[in-house]
């Protein structure tokens, strides 16, 4: 992580501790999947961790920005577009859909800080709701009725 | 959310805004299916939250600490120990286990903190990391082998 | 082999519940989707539900707010409730067994022989 | 639901006739379609399952095939004791639903 200068809050926005209050932002994931030992392809393993064991297998993919807190933030990809079937582990079942789990999670953007009178003065930080996703699910398609 | 002091740090305690660097907390998951709609049982709806039509149904828990940031978390607990099957939605299918997907995550727990003197001098933020669970997942059974 | 014989009122009157029951002879009556089928004079078949293993139970939407299927595997038997009958609810009601292929109900055999239920007043 | 149609709903035919009835589902259910004969006053009796499998003891001159939305139940050679109604089933989603059934008469 790259250092940041010292963050002077200026009136009208919040502290830092004021915003660690409200900082609800998941960590990278315990260990994404070894690419050599579990490629990243649509089927499901019987090793390795649990995104290539899912029947709705994903991926992460790094999401870093050096100006947001945290800086580096993983998204889930799903591999296929059904659930891969419990049987095979490797055809897709169309009776199931690989679903995205969203998460609206804060997260805070570095912002040259004004004084009264204009002046720069450090950095603050703007807190944002920002969607990650954090896995796929294997769903049953929604019926229209 | 209560209001807590502000925080002080002494000599040798990370600064709000370095703990802040580190802050990756989830928050609440959207929406807990609303009970009466949904209710808590092992079977995959065909509307409704992801986590009710998920072949791999789970529920929300509430954890609340008011000495904790964020005070509220949510942990996933599976309603069934397999995957529903897709044909029906009502019966679990035994080739495929449902399990939770973990995630060490990094809480800040309120502590007071004291002066060069031992002084209480209001309160500082220690970071901790903290296993919560965010989902369940449809999975094939580990080989051993 | 296995063998499944409906029994039941004849008769039912609008409004009430039919009550139905199959036994089943010849065969145990575990991991089996234990289902009824129905057929109103001289028209189509229709699936109404079934239950599985003595637990989970799946209903025919179009029926599913009035009906009931349990299954008594002390006394080898399954049975079906359908309250607040009409005349639309006379037919031939079936039991049958879902076979369980690959943890899926798959097909129907065998069937009882069938017992004719008319709502009338 | 998935609807299945049958054609013809009814057909005439001798005995020794090459029989063909079709089975048509709303959306693709692979090979998860069955065949059922009826007699009258009689329960259905499973003929074919998973699409073209013949059940134990079912004459082999009753086979069926297709996968996907479309079937075929087909008869070789037609005897006195196949004049009965036939339906199809799907069992790839529940709610299970039946064709509407072919009846097949002495011509």
């Known amino acids: 992580y790259s250092h940041w200068p010292s963050c002077c809050p200026s009136k009208g926005q919040d502290t830092s501790e004021e915003l660690l209050r409200w900082s609800t932002v998941p960590v990278p994931p315990l260990e994404p999947a070894r690419p050599n030992r579990h490629p990243e392809s649509c089927r499901a393993s019987e090793d390795g961790p649990l995104n290539s064991r899912a029947i709705s297998p994903w991926r992460y993919e790094l999401d870093r920005d050096l100006n947001r807190l945290p800086q580096d933030l993983y998204h889930a990809r799903c591999l296929c577009p059904h659930c891969v079937s419990l049987q095979t582990g490797s055809h897709m079942d169309p009776r199931g859909n690989s679903e995205l789990l969203y998460h609206n999670q804060t997260v805070f953007y570095r912002r040259p800080c004004h004084g009264e009178k204009g002046t720069h003065k450090g950095y603050c930080l703007e807190r944002r709701l920002y969607r990650v996703s954090l896995a796929c699910v294997c769903v049953r398609p929604r019926v229209m009725g | 959310y209560s209001h807590w002091p502000s925080c002080c740090p002494s000599k040798g305690q990370d600064t709000s805004e370095e703990l802040l660097r580190w802050s990756t907390v989830p928050v609440p998951p959207l929406e807990p299916a609303r009970p009466n709609r949904h209710p808590e049982s092992c079977r995959a709806s065909e509307d409704g939250p992801l986590n009710s039509r998920a072949i791999s149904p789970w529920r929300y828990e509430l954890d609340r600490d008011l000495n904790r940031l964020p005070q509220d978390l949510y942990h996933a607990r599976c309603l069934c120990p397999h995957c529903v099957s897709l044909q029906t939605g009502s019966h679990m299918d035994p080739r495929g286990n449902s399990e939770l997907l973990y995630h060490n995550q990094t809480v800040f727990y309120r502590r007071p903190c004291h002066g060069e003197k031992g002084t209480h001098k209001g309160y500082c933020l220690e970071r901790r990391l903290y296993r919560v669970s965010l989902a369940c997942v449809c999975v094939r059974p580990r080989v051993m082998g | 082999q296995v063998q499944l014989q409906e029994s039941g009122p004849g008769l039912v009157k609008p409004s009430e519940t039919l009550s139905l029951t199959c036994t089943v002879s010849?065969?145990?009556?575990?991991?089996?989707?234990w289902s009824w089928i129905r057929q109103p004079p001289g028209k189509g078949l229709e699936w109404i539900g079934f239950?599985?293993?003595?637990?989970?139970?799946n209903y025919n939407p179009s029926l599913k707010s009035r009906v009931t299927i349990s299954v008594d595997t002390s006394k080898n038997q399954f049975s079906l409730k359908l309250s607040s009958v009409t005349a639309a609810d006379t037919a031939v009601y079936y039991c049958?067994?879902?076979?369980?292929?690959?943890?899926?109900?798959?097909?129907?055999?065998?069937w009882g022989q069938g017992t004719l239920v008319t709502v009338s007043s | 639901d998935i609807q299945m149609t049958q054609s013809p709903s009814s057909l005439s035919a001798s005995v020794g006739d090459r029989v063909t009835i079709t089975c048509r589902a709303s959306?693709?259910?692979?090979?998860?379609l069955n065949w059922y004969q009826q007699k009258p006053g009689k329960a259905p009796k499973l003929l074919i399952y998973?699409?073209?499998s013949l059940q134990s003891g079912v004459p082999s001159r009753f086979s069926g095939s297709g996968s996907g939305t479309d079937f075929t139940l087909t008869i070789s050679s037609l005897q006195p004791e196949d004049f009965a109604t036939y339906y199809c089933?799907?069992?790839?989603?529940?709610?299970?639903?039946f064709g509407g059934g072919t009846k097949v008469e002495i011509k």
């Open positions: 959306q693709s259910i692979s090979s998860y």
């Open positions: 010849g065969g145990s009556i575990s991991n089996y989707f």
């Open positions: 998973a699409a073209s």
């Open positions: 239950n599985y293993n003595s637990g989970s139970t």
């Open positions: 089933q799907q069992s790839y989603l529940t709610p299970l639903t």
């Open positions: 049958a067994r879902g076979y369980n292929w690959n943890y899926e109900i798959a097909w129907f055999d065998p």
